[in-house]
């Protein structure tokens, strides 16, 4: 009975001229992997990794397909023609054959650079804006509190000519910093400090096949 499942890197994108790692991982089975075949969209062979014979790279791809990491495959010098489906076929004993699918989209350098240039800085800009707003609110709150303490001091001094209308608005002031903290925490989930190592150490991420971050960090898979 085949109990295993193939986990793949799913839908990935990379820029023209760059490189990308294709990775499949067989889990939930004790079966021994005897061979892994990598095929392209038209089912033409890219490479084979045999447990006893090592790697066989299809000759036409020898100069731009690198074996590994692990049972995966690295495609280099990507062209627009590389866009499409890729399949990993695991021959195992005693289970038999498992198959996984990856879709690779190769983006024009200008498009990739555009999205890289504007998408990530946009997150940065938003984070910066939130920080600026937070600082501004904090400054307002601090100044307001200073004014309050000055007024209290004035009352004690017998100067009671000011009304307390302004002071009634002060309790609502601590609310923005609270929402600001939540807003600041959100970008950290998008490859911020908490997942910085995962984003930076791309190759380690694929070797370990830690899929926990795939949903939140779609640009992990690009190694251009």
């Amino acid at each position: 009975m085949m109990t295993g499942t193939i986990e793949t890197t799913g839908n990935i994108s990379a820029k023209k001229g760059g490189s990308v790692i294709l990775q499949c991982h067989l889990s939930s089975t004790m079966a021994q992997v005897t061979q892994v075949n990598w095929e392209q969209h038209d089912h033409s062979l890219l490479a084979i990794r045999n447990a006893e014979l090592g790697w066989h790279i299809y000759p036409a791809f020898k100069d731009r397909v690198a074996p590994g990491p692990g049972l995966g495959l690295t495609l280099q010098s990507l062209t627009m023609n590389d866009t499409g489906e890729y399949f990993c076929t695991y021959h195992t004993y005693p289970d038999g054959t498992y198959r996984g699918r990856i879709f690779l989209e190769v983006l024009e350098s200008s498009v990739a650079e555009h999205s890289a240039r504007f998408q990530i800085p946009l997150l940065g800009a938003m984070a910066m804006m939130l920080v600026v707003i937070c600082i501004a609110v904090i400054v307002v709150v601090v100044l307001a509190r200073k004014k309050k303490s000055l007024r209290i001091h004035s009352v004690e001094s017998g100067l009671q000519r000011k009304s307390t209308g302004q002071e009634e608005q002060i309790p609502s002031a601590p609310s923005p910093p609270g929402s600001c903290v939540q807003a600041e925490a959100a970008p950290a989930g998008l490859c911020g400090e908490q997942q910085g190592d995962d984003c930076a150490e791309l190759h380690d991420y694929f070797n370990v096949l830690s899929y926990r971050s795939l949903g939140s960090c779609s640009f992990f898979t690009e190694t251009g």
Epitope: E52, G54, H56, Y58, P59, K62, H91, Y93, T97
Partner: antibody
Amino acid sequence: QVQLVQSGAEVKKPGASVKVSCKASGYTFTRYSMYWVRQAPGQGLEWIAFIDAYSGGSTYNQRFRGKATLTVDTSISTAYMELSRLRSDDTAVYYCARGGDYGWYLGVWGQGTLVTVSS
Amino acid sequence: DIQMTQSPSSLSASVGDRVTITCRPSENIYTYLSWYQQKPGKAPKLLIYNAKSLPSGVPSRFSGSGSGTDFTLTISSLQPEDFATYYCQHHYGNPLTFGQGTKVEIK
């Protein structure tokens, strides 16, 4: 067209070594592995080893570890197999063959080199 | 090691005959099997790879089939130049091994 031309017949004494060459032409040498197979007189085919001409890495049949050593000279598109500590049962025709496009089979063969080990 | 058992070891046939040679590996090799033809004093020549694929230049009267542990080489209509010895070879593990050969002789 793809061609593999092997060096000529050799007669060696037991304990000696021999180096057989295989000159490739008609294709990009480094894109394929080179295989070596032997055939004793009147016998079947026996795979010895192959070498990846791109990386220089070799994979051997365990039976021939310490007996055969494979090398390549990419500048002249030539593969070599050196056989050491020759014995009379090493007498055979030795073939080089270019690996296949789609796996570990033998696509194009050289004409063979007869190595005779005799005292 | 994967043992390759070919049968028959020899056969006699006439020009125009349909000839079938079988090869049985000792374990599952999926479709990683090739066939070679060797004439006396000559180097072997690739006939079939991956169980059923024909390299360019090989006549279409040669065909291969099978998977797992049972493979067949068929010559649909034997020609005078087909009298030779045929070998199967697996390419699924180390060591790569060949069958002992099937000699096709003129009846």
